[in-house]
């Protein structure tokens, strides 16, 4: 009785179960009743990452430097190349097909999380007691200067964009 379903790592063809090709190999010819499935290794620039019956291997991803990409991990016959972005850039999407410059946090905002090759800068508003007076992809909100510790008094209150201005105390005689 011809099978209607096959075991794992097999496929059904011409009423019989044939072995799938292992990762890193492509199908050359199906099995017969007497002869095993014929598979061939993918070439150097190609890969297949699953047990398969593909007649062509997939091309490794190209990390295009013109799009700000570089190779993070070289592909093998079983894995695709992994691209990441050059310094100062991050992936535009999950598939990382191109890169964009990291976002800078505007004055009044500080860096909560520095950007990586795959994620953009995360900014946060500077809370009371902190400020940022620069547009930066690295600078966190900095605390206002403590005038008291310098034996000074606050002459101008700080904001989220400016530090406090300290001045000498008025000495009363």
């Amino acid at each position: 009785e011809p099978p209607t379903a096959c075991r794992e790592k097999q496929y059904l063809i011409n009423s019989q179960c044939c072995s799938l090709c292992q990762p890193g190999q492509k199908l050359v010819s199906d099995c017969t009743e007497f002869t095993e499935t014929e598979c061939l290794p993918c070439s150097e620039s190609e890969f297949l990452d699953t047990w398969n019956r593909e007649t062509r291997c997939h091309q490794h991803k190209y990390c295009d430097p013109n799009l700000g990409l570089r190779v993070q991990q070289k592909g093998t016959s079983e894995t695709d190349t992994i691209c990441t972005c050059e310094e100062g850039l991050h992936c535009m999407s999950e598939s990382c097909e191109s890169c964009v410059p990291h976002r800078s946090c505007l004055p009044g905002f500080g860096v909560k999380q520095i950007a990586t090759g795959v994620s953009d800068t995360i900014c946060e508003p500077c809370p009371v007691g902190f400020f940022s007076n620069v547009s930066s992809a690295f600078e966190k909100c900095r605390p206002w200067t403590s005038c008291e510790t310098k034996d000074l008094v606050v002459q101008q209150a700080g904001t989220n964009k400016t530090d406090v201005v300290c001045g000498p105390q008025d000495r009363q005689r």
Epitope: N14, S29, D30, C31, T32, E33, F34, T35, E36, E38
Partner: antibody, heavy 120, light 112 residues
Framework: QVQLVESGGGVVQPGRSLRLSCAAS????????MHWVRQAPGKGLEWVAV????????YHADSVKGRFTISRDNSKITLYLQMNSLRTEDTAVYYC?????????????WGQGTLVTVSS | DIVMTQSPLSLTVTPGEPASISCRSS???????????LDWYLQKPGQSPQVLIS???NRASGVPDRFSGSGSGTDFTLKISRVEAEDVGVYYC?????????FGPGTKVDIR
């Protein structure tokens, strides 16, 4: 290149046994079905038996069924034909041949053959 | 069992002339995948058989293109467009449609 070398032939008396071997090289033996085909002196070709790559399927011609057994040892890269209860009509050159698979079903590469003579 | 017949059983040809051999099977050799499971072999004098044609019409690697196979179902033909001296020998058809595999009786080709 594919090479098949048969051995084990010779002169044997009727009713006796003989085991033929076929040493393979130049291809992945464990992936291919294998055949035995024979040719009586001055006669045509007669298919004898076939065995699948992992031994799960084997078939024999009616003329040898119950007397001859095809087998293989993939670790030794060798095909065998165990011949029991030999008859004078089994006298022939015995060829081993590789099965061509889906692109060329049937024997595609043949050995040079080994002569078996059954005579009293 | 499938019975194979060939005609003619003997053929003498002039070098450079065409030759044709017919092969018939007692059952259809056409499989559901669209292929005819018929092979042609040549056995040169003192040598082992060599495959010429597989699946009715597929020339085996290294076989000169003067050899061609055609036909379907139960009727098949092997043609040699221009016979050469090295083509002498016995030509066999064989069915690989089902076990037991069976050969035709052979066609002996000689050069005039």
């Amino acid at each position: 290149q594919v090479q098949l070398v048969e051995s084990g032939g010779g002169v044997v008396q009727p009713g006796r046994s003989l085991r033929l071997s076929c040493a393979a090289s130049g291809f992945t033996f464990s992936s291919y079905g294998m055949h035995w085909v024979r040719q009586a002196p001055g006669k045509g070709l007669e298919w004898v038996a076939v065995i699948s790559y992992e031994e799960s399927n084997r078939y024999h011609a009616d003329s040898v069924k119950g007397r001859f057994t095809i087998s293989r040892d993939n670790s030794k890269i060798t095909l065998y034909l165990q011949m029991n209860s030999l008859r004078t009509e089994d006298t022939a050159v015995y060829y081993c041949a590789r099965d061509g698979g889906i692109a060329a079903p049937g024997p595609d590469y043949w050995g040079q053959g080994t002569l078996v003579t059954v005579s009293s | 069992d499938i019975v194979m017949t060939q005609s003619p059983l003997s053929l003498t040809v002039t070098p450079g002339e065409p030759a044709s051999i017919s092969c018939r099977s007692s059952q259809s050799l056409l499989y559901s995948n669209g292929y005819n499971y018929l092979d042609w072999y040549l056995q040169k004098p003192g040598q082992s058989p060599q495959v010429l044609i597989s699946l009715g019409s597929n020339r085996a690697s290294g076989v000169p293109d003067r050899f061609s196979g055609s036909g379907s179902g139960t009727d098949f033909t092997l043609k040699i467009s221009r016979v050469e001296a090295e083509d002498v020998g016995v030509y066999y058809c064989m069915q690989a449609r089902q076990t037991p595999f069976t050969f035709g009786p052979g066609t002996k080709v000689d050069i005039r």
